[in-house]
């Protein structure tokens, strides 16, 4: 609530401020206009979160935010007669929402998800410190292309980590990747505090490994041609090409930002294919090539998750040791 009487020039406070949760992590505040607002006032609403973050002045009587409900979050709302930020709004009314109850030590930790090849999402977590070893976990997820919250069925265990994976295919709709997946993990018995996470679809993307199609020598240059993982266009990927030479026992790594197949030596117009020329390679020795890829910042927020390495391909001949 507010405090003190409002100065005469300010509007009365908004009424009926309430808060609700939709989906898993969409928090919505709604309110009614102030009672007794002056008739010559075109009402605008000033709002910000408890820590004075995300100030907004808008005519709508609602505000929403996508936030993992692991901590209490509060919104303060006031009314004013213009969009001017320097105008003093009415007394601010505050409404908070708290996370579900439970022992914080029981909540799972390190809840994170990776979108594998834009086709399925794999989430994993560690049990909370204060939980029973036989806890049965359930993961729920929601994103915009789903009508309702879904329960993840494929729970697995990898060492101390638990996890679950679910299908999530990139939709041709251009705005799909501007959205997020909302995640919640709790236990079947309701003993642990639920944990939430929001996974932006432009981050934590791990492509499948590429597939090497062709290696060929032209003079002392090695031409490498490969097929990129499905669902990715080549300009959205960054490449690492590793070449090992058996004779010199050298291990060369090339970081490739653009991998166009423009050289006449490359097979051209092959869809989703990339190419790179490795200079100064000895053709009469055995050279083994492998490649991995990751998303780049042209198309994605995150560029940290490398794919696994491709299968190796070799060219040249192994010299007899005499």
């Amino acid at each position: 609530g507010g405090g003190g009487a409002a100065p005469t020039e300010t509007q009365p406070p908004v009424t009926n401020l309430s808060v609700s949760v939709e989906n898993l992590c969409t928090v919505i505040w709604t309110w009614n206009p102030p009672e007794g607002a002056s008739s010559n006032c075109s009402l605008w609403y000033f709002s910000h979160f408890g820590d004075k973050q995300d100030k907004k002045i808008a005519p709508e009587t609602r505000r929403s935010i996508e936030v993992p409900l692991n901590e209490r979050i509060c919104l303060q709302v006031g009314s004013q007669c213009s969009t001017n930020e320097s105008e003093k709004p009415s007394i601010l009314v505050e409404k908070c929402i708290s996370p579900p109850e439970g022992d914080p030590e029981s909540a799972v930790t390190e809840l994170q998800c990776i979108w594998h090849n834009l086709s399925y999402m794999k989430c994993s977590w560690l049990p909370g410190r204060n939980t029973s070893p036989d806890t049965n976990y359930t993961l729920y997820y929601w994103h915009r292309s789903l009508e309702k919250i879904h329960q993840c069925e494929n729970i697995f265990r990898e060492g101390q980590y638990f996890g679950c994976s679910f299908d999530l295919t990139k939709v041709k709709d251009s705005s799909f990747e501007q959205h997020s997946v909302q995640i919640m993990v709790k236990d079947n018995a309701g003993k642990i505090k639920p944990s939430f996470n929001i996974v932006p679809l432009t981050s934590r993307v791990k492509p499948d490994p590429p597939h090497i199609k062709n290696l060929s020598f032209h003079n002392d240059d090695l031409y490498v041609q490969w097929e990129n993982p499905q669902n990715f266009i080549s300009r959205c990927l960054f490449y690492e090409v590793e070449v090992n030479n058996s004779q010199t026992e050298t291990h060369n790594v090339f970081y490739v930002q653009e991998a166009k197949c423009e050289n006449p030596e490359f097979e051209r117009n092959v869809e989703n294919t990339s190419c790179f020329m490795v200079p100064g390679v000895l053709p009469d020795t055995l050279n083994t090539v492998r490649i991995r890829v990751k998303t780049n910042k042209l198309c994605y927020e995150d560029d940290k998750l490398w794919s696994n390495w491709s299968q190796e391909m070799s060219i040249g001949k192994k010299r007899n040791s005499t």
């Epitope: 030590e105 930790t109 390190e110 049990p127 410190r129 939980t131 990898e158 060492g159 101390q160």
Partner: antibody, heavy 118, light 107 residues
Framework: EVQVLESGGGLVQPGGSLRLSCAAS????????MTWVRQAPGKGLEWVST????????YYADSVKGRFTISRDNSKNTVYLQMNSLRAEDTAVYYC???????????WGRGTLVTVSS | EIVLTQSPDFQSVTPKEKVTITCRAS??????LHWYQQKPDQSPKLLIK???QSFSGVPSRFSGSGSGTDFTLTINSLEAEDAAAYYC?????????FGQGTKLEIK
């Protein structure tokens, strides 16, 4: 075979530093927390520090907080314990252990002796 | 933090005897208690997890029981190779704590 092997112990003066390493093999390293436990000569076991499999969660005993730093390199299957501002009471055999399930230690190394003395 | 108190501190026993070591927690820890054995000049080894579950490869003469605050490690028909120090450990929250240890000597 699942095993862990400590190294880096030795004699150091009070106030000095030492870095212990623990090399692991035979299991998927990044899926398991690793822990350091120490044992002063003729005494019992004392938990020192734990780091989760992906390195996001790190815990220390009050007796070493602010002086010791645990870290891991999952590409090298190795966990480290950087020990600064060492004191005589830090003298102990330091064991590295793999953590399993709900926090029990199923694999232990042979230990490495750290002696803090002038 | 959880304080674990073992008893006895020391026990001298003859082979084939039954040995009982107890561990009392300062507050309820459910089944978050594990037992370790440490033979002279060796590193500790896990014997019992979650108060009563035998760890793989541990001889069947070792068993554990209890929950909450009172726990017991039992060695049925003691063998000479069981001469060691035995420690209980709590994993109910942090810090992990160990009991002070029970040293078992074979007569």
């Amino acid at each position: 075979e699942v095993q862990v092997l400590e190294s880096g112990g030795g004699l150091v003066q009070p106030g000095g530093s030492l870095r212990l390493s623990c090399a692991a093999s035979g299991f998927t390293f990044s899926n398991y927390a690793m822990t350091w436990v120490r044992q002063a000569p003729g005494k019992g076991l004392e938990w020192v520090s734990t780091i989760s499999g992906r390195g996001y969660s790190i815990y220390y005993a009050d007796s070493v907080k602010g002086r010791f730093t645990i870290s891991r390199d999952n590409s090298k299957n190795t966990v480290y314990l950087q020990m600064n501002s060492l004191r005589a009471e830090d003298t102990a055999v330091y064991y590295c252990a793999k953590e399993e399930g709900h926090w029990y230690f199923d694999v232990w190394g042979r230990g490495t002796l750290v002696t803090v003395s002038s | 933090e959880i304080v674990l108190t073992q008893s006895p501190d020391f026990q001298s026993v003859t082979p084939k005897e039954k040995v009982t070591i107890t561990c009392r927690a300062s507050q309820s820890i459910g089944s978050s208690l594990h037992w370790y054995q440490q033979k002279p000049d060796q590193s500790p080894k896990l014997l019992i997890k979650y108060a009563s579950q035998s760890f793989s490869g541990v001889p069947s003469r070792f068993s554990g029981s209890g929950s909450g605050t009172d726990f017991t490690l039992t060695i049925n028909s003691l063998e000479a190779e069981d001469a060691a120090a035995y420690y209980c450990k709590s994993s109910a929250g942090l810090p992990y704590t160990f009991g002070q240890g029970t040293k078992l000597e074979i007569k």
